[in-house]
């Protein structure tokens, strides 16, 4: 059998079975399921004198592992004293020790009920800046309890001096409050109130509930694509309104500029979705120079059924700039698909996240529908990255075996583009 460390259990009597005039009492410690021999059991009796006796180990029939009991007999003021049984098993490791601290006897007790309550949303249905969690520990036989708050299973450093205990009749209740920032609460972590009482653990957990449908009307305002801004030089921004209920009232989308200057004529499109909601988009051409110089554009959405207008604004992204690095690869031939190949393009370490990706063949830009490009993803400390994938046919690479992956980004120089060529059969 392989090495196995012991499980350790305290052995106590029921308090009501010990005569009130008893001058000495015996308690024990069971170490079981260990292999090989031996275990060393020592006792910490505090200020009291005690005598110990460790029984010879017995073999557990099914597993072949060992079990032993150590008994401690103490005299004196044992009722208020806590005792520690320390079990060491050097075959497991030289420093393997398990401590069990307990009193001479166990009382009958009513265990607590543990329940977490949380503070309400504000009047507008939003989370307040801080969220209070209240742990109610109720209906237990009075005695020492320990309350610990955990965040995703990790002990939190919480001031527990605010915990208050009340007694009603023969039972007690305690409450402990935890204050969280809105950000921590919205981070989707699980918060647990863990109560230790009479050697047992009781707990309750909570986390932010998932958003419930139906959602309200939402509005989004996009920035111009780098391709439209720097290559076509005809940038547009789009105001998108989703989850509208089709009704007689019209949705009004009005555009304005923070500078107060006039806006161009916008185009509008309405689409009924499969789920019965209406989507409205309004596209506004903007001046290239106006955008680059930092003009702010606003889209205002009004509708008879909306309690108030929705306002969205957009402007050039602030923050540091970093040009993209572009790497293009061709995948090797795959059995059974000799007439098709996949090209991949990794574009990374760019800031801000706005980027356009194009593929060219024979100096001609391929339609966007031909390639699939991920949304920009954040990296730790070095901007964003995207992957783009293009499937090409034998006819294409036999006509000209050079494909170009091009990134359009404001920090790229010269002329806001960086490109890399890739061949299906390099060197041929």
């Amino acid at each position: 059998a392989s090495t196995q460390s012991p499980s350790v259990f305290p052995l106590t009597r029921c308090c009501k079975n010990i005569p009130s005039n008893a001058t000495s009492v015996t308690l024990g410690c069971l170490a079981t399921g260990y292999f090989p021999e031996p275990v060393m059991v020592t006792w910490d009796t505090g200020s009291l004198n005690g005598t110990t006796m460790t029984l010879p180990a017995t073999t557990l029939t099914l597993s072949g592992h060992y079990a032993t009991i150590s008994l401690l007999t103490v005299s004196g003021a044992w009722a208020k004293q806590m005792f520690t049984c320390r079990v060491a098993h050097t075959p497991s490791s030289t420093d393997w020790v398990d401590n069990k601290t307990f009193s001479v006897c166990s009382r009958d007790f009513t265990p607590p009920t543990v329940k977490i309550l949380q503070s309400s949303c504000d009047g507008g249905g939003h989370f307040p800046p801080t969220i209070q969690l209240l742990c109610l520990v109720s209906g237990y036989t009075p005695g020492t309890i320990n309350i610990t708050w955990l965040e995703d299973g990790q002990v939190m450093d919480v001031d527990l001096s605010t915990a208050s205990t009340t007694q009603e009749g023969e039972l007690a209740s305690t409450q402990s409050e935890l204050t969280l920032s809105q950000k921590h609460w919205l981070s989707d972590r699980t918060y647990t109130c863990q109560v230790t009482y009479q050697g047992h653990t009781f707990e309750d957990s909570t986390k932010k509930c998932a958003d419930s449908n139906p959602r309200g009307v939402s509005a989004y305002l996009s920035r111009p694509s780098p391709f439209d801004l720097f290559i076509r030089k005809s940038p547009t921004i789009t105001c998108l309104v989703v989850d509208l209920a089709p009704s007689k009232g019209t949705v009004n989308l009005t555009w304005s500029r923070a500078s107060g200057k006039p806006v161009n004529h916008s185009t509008r499109k309405e689409e009924k979705q499969r789920n019965g909601t209406l989507t409205v988009t309004s596209t506004l051409p903007v001046g290239t120079r106006d955008w680059i110089e930092g003009e702010t554009y606003q889209c205002r959405v009004t509708h008879p059924h909306l309690p108030r207008a929705l306002m969205r604004s957009t402007t050039k992204t602030s923050g540091p700039r970093a040009a993209p690095e572009v790497y293009a690869f061709a995948t090797p031939e795959w059995p059974g698909s000799r007439d098709k190949r996949t090209l991949a393009c990794l574009i990374q370490n760019f800031m801000p996240e706005d980027i356009s990706v194009q593929w060219l063949h024979n100096e001609v830009q391929l339609p966007d529908a031909r390639h699939s490009t991920t949304q920009p993803r954040k990296t730790k400390g070095s901007g964003f990255f995207v992957f783009s994938r293009l499937e090409v046919t034998r006819a294409e690479w036999e006509q000209k075996d050079e494909f170009i992956c091009r990134a359009v980004h404001e920090a790229a120089s010269p002329s806001q583009t960086v490109q890399r060529a890739v061949s299906v059969n390099p060197g041929k």
Epitope: P129, S181, K183, H184, M351, K378, K380, G381, G383
Partner: nanobody, 122 residues
């Protein structure tokens, strides 16, 4: 709408001090970790320092450790960067930044201010 406005930049002699401020609005400032990021002319962006929501946990880039101190005043929605013993290589545009994620350390942030220029030269 998140707004961050930096101030306090300027021209300072090597060895001198400078204090940058960042006024935040449009979000619950005390619920967000905050950071400072800089970019020297012709160089890539560099994370400088971060501070957690309560102001107890701070992190610094090795290049500024012991010279720069980040702090915050949640009551007034303000973030600060006290820069001492400034060197010519500290010359850069400095931005205060924040993020929807936990962002104590180098990161690509969701929100930046407009930036403030710091020039260290004799």
């Amino acid at each position: 709408e998140v707004q961050l406005v930096e101030s306090g930049g300027g021209l300072v002699q090597p060895g001198g001090p400078l204090r940058l401020s960042c006024a935040a609005s449009g979000f619950t400032f005390g619920s967000y970790d905050m950071s400072w990021v800089r970019q020297a002319p012709g160089k890539g962006p560099e994370w400088v320092s971060s501070i957690d929501t309560g102001g107890d946990i701070t992190h610094y880039a090795d290049s500024v450790k012991g010279r720069f101190t980040i702090s915050r005043d949640n009551a007034n929605n303000m973030l600060y960067l006290q820069m001492n013993s400034l060197k010519p290589e500290d010359t850069a545009v400095y931005w205060c930044a924040t993020d929807e994620d936990y962002a104590l350390g180098p990161n690509e942030y969701d929100y930046y201010g407009q930036g403030t220029q710091v020039t260290v030269s004799s």
